[in-house]
């Protein structure tokens, strides 16, 4: 049964398809494969803390250690990547904090940002100084393990020199890598000594070896690619938002809710209200009013602006976000001060009512 009563005839669904919103990432913890990772649950006053990964309960095992408010992952692998949450259960409510873990190699993100500097990798030699191939920029080759989300672009580089100028070819799992070996083929940029694969899929996993050779010698370097698959997830709200606020009577105030969602998020701003002098209906459920929701006629739904506030505007404001997978919500309190008191930004905490997640 629903755990609140809506005041007036306010629908919980948008009447028209909502517009897409700027989305914000939750905090991301990055580790290289093989490293250990420690994350502290950023929630206060937790009687009991439970952990989940991608919505599934997380228990201790030989690599995962749960001690109090700390989660430790030993010898991280790409399979440890995902959406984590810690939930603090208290006597009256519970609160959840989300974060991402990405066990990956940052330089395989696929951006061509460093291709502009590729010219220095193409070293021209004095024609008299014959020389076997050699690496010119080993820094760009240090990380051999690349864990990349599916659909991303991957770039492997083997900057080299030699005289005469060496040629470069690529092997996959020790065999000649042909264009027809993957959907969409791949690009080789000889000027930048790079192999580029767009929109990687699980079948792209494997060892990629660049072989650089001329008549005086041959060198090679192997990268390992792991493709991390994604799963759809419910909305994530940035921790600490909306933030508690205070203002004087007649002042203006803004609450902000930062949303991260793969799918179309439906954002609602809800406030506890009174009806006939009561905050609760006959069923014992609180009266709530939808102040704003995302839709065609709504401007940036991530922001709730209140103008010329009165004492009646004081109270708890809930940012509730849903998509087809599920919901998330966080709330903040507005304190309205008499005119003679100066307003101040309060400590940024979130409070979750017990009938919302």
């Amino acid at each position: 049964r629903p755990s609140f009563s809506l005041v007036e005839d306010t629908t919980l669904e948008p009447e028209e398809p909502p517009t897409k919103y700027q989305i914000s990432q939750p905090e991301v913890y990055v580790a290289a494969p093989g490293e250990s990772l420690e994350v502290r649950c950023l929630l206060k006053d937790a009687a009991v803390i439970s952990w989940t990964k991608d919505g599934v309960h997380l228990g201790p095992n030989n690599r995962t250690v749960l001690i109090g408010e700390y989660l430790q992952i030993k010898g991280a692998t790409p399979r440890d990547s995902g959406l984590y949450a810690c939930t603090a259960s208290r006597t009256v409510d519970s609160e959840t904090w989300y974060f991402m873990v990405n066990v990956t190699d940052a330089i395989s993100s696929g951006d061509d940002e460093d291709d502009t500097d590729g010219a220095e990798d193409f070293v021209s030699e004095n024609s008299n100084n014959k020389r076997a191939p050699y690496w010119t920029n080993t820094e760009k080759m240090e990380k051999r393990l690349h864990a990349v989300p599916a659909a991303n672009t991957v770039k492997f580089r083997c900057p080299a020199g030699g005289n005469p100028m060496p040629t470069m070819r690529w092997l996959k799992n020790g065999k000649e890598f042909k264009q027809e070996h993957r959907i969409g083929g791949y690009k080789v940029r000889n000027q930048h000594w790079s192999l580029i694969m767009e929109s990687v899929v699980p079948s792209d996993k494997g060892n990629y070896t660049c072989v650089v050779e001329n008549e005086y010698g041959s060198i090679n370097h192997t990268y390992h690619l792991d493709v991390v698959e994604r799963s759809p997830h419910r909305p994530i709200l940035q921790a600490g938002l909306p933030a508690n606020a205070s203002t004087v009577v007649g002042g203006d105030v803004e609450f902000v809710c930062k949303v991260y969602s793969d799918a179309q998020p439906h954002i609602q701003w809800i406030k506890h209200v009174e009806k006939n002098g009561s905050k609760y209906g006959p069923d014992g459920l609180p009266y709530l009013k939808v102040l704003k929701h995302s839709g065609i006629n709504s401007s940036n739904a991530e922001v709730l602006a209140l103008f010329n506030v009165t004492e009646a505007d004081a109270g708890e404001y809930i940012c509730k976000v849903s998509n087809y997978i599920g919901q998330a919500n966080q709330s903040a309190w507005l304190t309205v001060l008499p005119k003679q008191q100066a307003p101040g930004r309060e400590k940024e905490i979130t409070a979750s009512p017990d009938y919302l997640e």
């Epitope: 755990s3 087809y324 997978i325 599920g326 997640e357």
Partner: antibody
Amino acid sequence: QVQLVQSGAEVKKPGSSVKVSCKASGYIFTSYNVHWVRQAPGQGLEWIGSIYPDNGDSSYNQNYKGRATITADKSTSTAYMELSSLRSEDTAVYYCARGDFAYWGQGTLVTVSS
Amino acid sequence: DIQMTQSPSSLSASVGDRVTITCKASNGISNDIAWYQQKPGKAPKLLIYSASYRYSGVPSRFSGSGSGTDFTFTISSLQPEDIATYYCQQHSTTPYTFGQGTKLEIK
């Protein structure tokens, strides 16, 4: 592993009601919507509605509003879909699915016949 | 409600063929579309979500693309086990509507 197990097949008379259950396991029941989808014999898929078990928020296809009632019991991790005023056209397989539509129940055949 | 118009309603192809199914939404839905495979007597199986993301464990021969109102689902090299009915579904706004389905058969 994630599982959604539905109740067994039902044969109902026109005008009566049917209540189909969907027991979830292997994931946090309150963290995902539960959707209900139906498929008439030889026909396509039709979304009936969904519920967010944590707070009971439900959403319905207007074609079923007033006839379909979706509920959830957090204590048993079970979702229910009740369809009233049954008619022969309601003969179909009824599926529950987790919020991401990645996991589905095995389906419950409801036959409406006089 | 957003209507999803799927075509063709049926198609016959040979093993190894490239197969393409299209879905057109009556309103813009950004990339909020999923593709499912359903075999007789079984529940649908999620293949693609958010237009182009392959769900975990789905073979790489299945892919999706498109944005706004026009979407495409492709099987790069048809396998015998791919014989099934395929559905698109928009998950942008309720009610979450499905296409009419495409029945895929082997020549």
